[in-house]
């Protein structure tokens, strides 16, 4: 999916009032010293597409954090305020249900959403020019 | 605990430069943006510039453009503003401040360091 | 660049009172909007980011409102820590300007 149709002011409306929140949530009880942000972006859309990625895709020692409260949230602004994006989830959803697991709190996953708020982080900045 | 502590007051001559500490502590430093502010005697907040303490990309008002230089050091978890060709009016109380978790603003501020310009 | 006009430039009021102060933006900011109250000799403190999402530990009786434009900072019923200083900064595009400020002080 392109995210550059998207509405970011709106995604961004969204994130800080409840997803940020929920993410929070979820990494509490660790340190903020714990992580470096390792995964990056460059402009809202990358932003999108790697958040896109570290929520919705399983990785080895996170097997799926799409059933977290924050996840369902994501996915649920990125359907109201992108076009064509719920459309393009439906396969994915359906092969979701299909490997749903018990949820489990690893260091991994936590490590991955730790790196979802810095791209989040970056998604909402302010654009940064040079003068 | 957050922290950012700043260096100490600071009195220089006009024409002269200035190099103003900020050490940060109890977050991970790389991930997160550094801003500089200042405040002259019974003014308001002036935006000077932000800093990327990762990449070491900097941001800068036009005001200040090509007399402030900010600066971050990773191993110290420290960042620097140097300002050159001091004159009075650059009398003020310096700070920095560390970005939020959420990108939207900047949450914890050093206790500022005051800055005297005088001949 | 984008410029921040607060107003009023000073407010008296008592403990208790309900007290608005505004935010304007010479253009359109959506809700990229920052609030801070400064205290004397001390350096400032975050309140509202996003325009209306309280800062952690900030009293429920300030709230803030508003996009686009037109911003405003409400404190339901002043307490005696209230008097003080209060900015807007926006957070949309560098620079990021603040506004001129307003002084709260005890009628």
């Known amino acids: 999916y392109d995210f550059t149709n998207c509405d970011f002011e709106k995604i961004k409306a969204a994130y800080l009032s409840t997803i940020s929140k929920d993410l929070i949530t979820y990494m509490s009880g660790t340190k903020s010293t714990e992580f470096n942000n390792t995964v990056s972006c460059s402009n809202r859309p990358h932003c999108l597409t790697e958040i896109q990625s570290l929520t919705f895709n399983p990785t080895a020692g996170c097997a799926s954090l799409a059933k977290e409260m924050f996840a369902m949230k994501t996915k649920a602004a990125l359907a109201i305020w992108c076009p064509g994006y719920s459309e393009t989830q439906i396969n994915a959803t359906q092969a979701m249900k299909k490997r749903r697991k018990r949820k489990v709190t690893t260091n991994k996953c936590l490590e991955q959403v730790s790196q979802l708020q810095g791209l989040w982080r970056r998604f909402n900045r302010p654009l940064l020019k040079q003068q | 605990q957050v922290q950012l502590v700043q260096s100490g007051a600071e009195v220089k001559k006009p024409g002269a430069s200035v190099k103003v500490s900020c050490k940060a502590s109890?977050?991970?430093?790389?991930?997160?943006?550094i801003e500089w502010v200042r405040q002259a005697p019974g003014q308001g907040l002036e935006w000077m510039g932000i800093?990327?303490?990762?990449?070491?990309?900097?941001y800068y008002a036009q005001k200040f453009q090509g007399r402030v230089t900010l600066t971050a050091d990773k191993s110290t978890s420290t960042a620097y503003m140097e300002l050159s060709s001091l004159r009075s009016e650059d009398s003020a109380v310096y700070y920095c401040?560390?970005?939020?978790?959420?990108?939207?603003?900047?949450?914890?501020w050093g206790q500022g360091t005051t800055l005297t310009v005088s001949s | 660049d984008i410029q921040m006009t607060q107003s009023p430039s000073s407010l008296s009021a008592s403990v208790g009172d309900r007290v608005t102060i505004t935010c304007r933006a010479s253009?359109?900011?959506?809700?990229?909007l920052v609030w801070y109250q400064q205290k004397p000799g001390k350096a400032p403190q975050l309140l509202v980011y996003?325009?209306?999402n309280l800062a952690d530990g900030v009293p429920s009786r300030f709230s803030g409102s508003g996009s686009g434009t037109q911003f405003s900072l409400t404190i339901s019923s002043l307490q005696p820590e209230d008097f003080a200083t209060y900015y807007c900064q926006h957070f949309y595009e560098t620079p990021l300007t603040f506004g001129t400020g307003t002084k709260l002080e005890i009628k």
């Open positions: 253009e359109n900011i959506y809700s990229n």
């Open positions: 996003g325009a209306r």
């Open positions: 800093i990327n303490p990762e990449s070491g990309d900097t």
């Open positions: 109890g977050y991970a430093f790389t991930n997160y943006l």
């Open positions: 401040a560390k970005e939020s978790l959420t990108g939207s603003s900047y949450d914890y």
